[in-house]
């Protein structure tokens, strides 16, 4: 066909972003692009072109007519991790085509087992107390918080600093005594150690 | 359409080696691990190990280790199974088997039947 | 490793019946279970995942249950096309139970 005078190549105007989701919900990475003719657009993954609902009717994958790539959800198991990698979106038309920038697909998660439960401390009034914790492995990497007899541990109490997976009590009292659970927590959700007892004694 | 298609009937002498291939299609090959299983004559179903096509990482059984090689060739998206030191007992229908994101083998190859006989 | 053991191996039922296979795992596996048909000369087709959902395509009257060592797959009402040999499947470290062959009564 003729080059026509107002035909120009494609160009990325909205590239994607990186992204961190967790496995089972929906997600999309935008692409738009702008040409004369209308480019079309492909996903490619790791290198590898990514199959959509275009190609194949049952794809958990969307491509969008804005070009965007939308995931009905995502996939991710204990080996195959089919939706996690590096895309980029190409856009064509006959004049030429463009690639825009990578974006990453990272899967959150937050796995059950504690690297370290609390374990039970018998101090003496007035002592300091330590517990110590380390969350489940995750992505993003877990914060944690205490609880204390299943209340949440307010850390603004002067006698109470959390730093770290340390829980310090300094100048302990009875009333500190109890069943103490770290929470290890990110955008998948929350995981409880197992219930740490400390106990406070009177000299 | 997503499928397996995998490479025709072997015969073997004991002692020699065997290589089947599996050409995937319809998928991101590099996405999911590849199985190989096998199913001896009027027998139950045999797990021999997988390939991660993305980085050739593969993981086997005791009872292959050492006589099973699992390969990959990314450009035409077909996994490998060769199996060395051939006895009449891995007389098998092998099959290739794609693993889905919930850990379950979604895809199968139609079966290479492998006969080994002196 | 993980032994998967399936009862009973073979059974006998008539069109209409509800059946159920069970499959034992040897130590706990949550819901990492897996149910898989079979026809002879046929490669096995996926049925049930994750121990309770059921794969695209397959029938409703197929269903599996249980978590942790013991599971349960049910046919609530059997049809011609199901008789075949059944094999549960644990997807930690990948072995098979030995099969449940399904015969017309």
């Known amino acids: 066909s003729r080059l026509r005078q107002e035909d120009f190549p494609p160009r990325i105007v909205e590239h994607p972003s990186d992204v961190i989701v967790s496995k089972g919900e929906p997600t999309t990475l935008n692409c738009k692009a702008e040409g004369r003719p209308t480019p079309t657009i492909e996903w490619y993954k790791d290198g590898e072109r990514v199959e959509t609902d275009k190609d194949d009717p049952r794809s958990h994958r969307m491509l969008l007519p804005s070009g965007s790539l939308f995931f009905l959800r995502i996939v991710h198991g204990r080996r195959s991790k089919p939706d996690e990698g590096s895309y980029v979106c190409v856009a064509r038309n006959y004049l030429g085509e463009a690639v825009s920038r990578n974006a990453s697909l990272e899967v959150a998660l937050l796995r059950d087992d504690f690297r370290q439960n609390p374990t039970d401390v018998v101090v003496a009034a007035g002592e300091p107390a330590i517990l110590e914790c380390q969350p489940p492995r995750g992505h993003p990497e877990p914060t944690i918080y205490w609880k204390k007899d299943k209340v949440r541990i307010d850390d603004k109490e002067e006698r109470i600093s959390i730093r770290g997976g340390k829980l310090m009590i300094s100048n302990t009292r009875k009333s500190d005594a109890g069943m103490y659970t770290c929470v290890g927590t990110n955008m998948v959700g929350e995981r409880d150690s197992d219930p740490a007892e400390l106990t406070v004694f009177e000299r | 359409e997503v499928q397996l298609v995998q490479s025709g009937a072997e015969v073997k002498k004991p002692g020699a080696s065997v290589k089947v291939s599996c050409k995937a299609s319809g998928y991101t090959f590099t996405g999911y691990y590849m199985h190989w299983v096998r199913q001896a004559p009027g027998q139950g179903l045999e797990w021999m190990g997988w390939?991660?096509?993305?980085?050739?990482?593969?993981e086997f059984p005791q009872k292959f280790q050492g006589r099973v090689t699992m390969t990959r060739d990314t450009s035409i998206t077909t996994a490998y199974m060769d199996l060395s030191r051939l006895r009449s007992d891995d007389t098998a229908v092998y099959y290739c088997?794609?693993?889905?994101?919930?850990?379950?083998?979604?895809?199968w190859g139609q079966g290479t039947m492998v006969t080994v006989s002196s | 490793d993980i032994v998967m053991t399936q009862s009973p191996s073979s059974l006998s039922a008539s069109v209409g019946d509800r059946v159920t296979i069970t499959c034992r795992a040897s130590?706990?596996?949550?819901?990492?279970l897996n149910w898989y048909q079979q026809k002879p000369g046929k490669a096995p087709k996926l049925l049930i995942y994750?121990?309770?959902s059921l794969q695209s395509g397959v029938p409703s009257r197929f269903s599996g249950s249980g978590s942790g060592t013991d599971f349960t797959l049910t046919i609530s009402s059997l049809q011609p096309e199901d008789f075949a040999t059944y094999y549960c499947?644990?997807?930690?470290?990948?072995?098979f139970g030995g099969g449940t062959k399904v015969e017309i009564k």
């Open positions: 390939i991660n096509p993305k980085d050739g990482d593969t």
């Open positions: 088997a794609r693993e889905s994101g919930d850990d379950a083998f979604d895809i």
């Open positions: 994750a121990a309770s």
């Open positions: 130590q706990s596996i949550s819901s990492y």
């Open positions: 499947q644990q997807s930690v470290g990948l072995s």
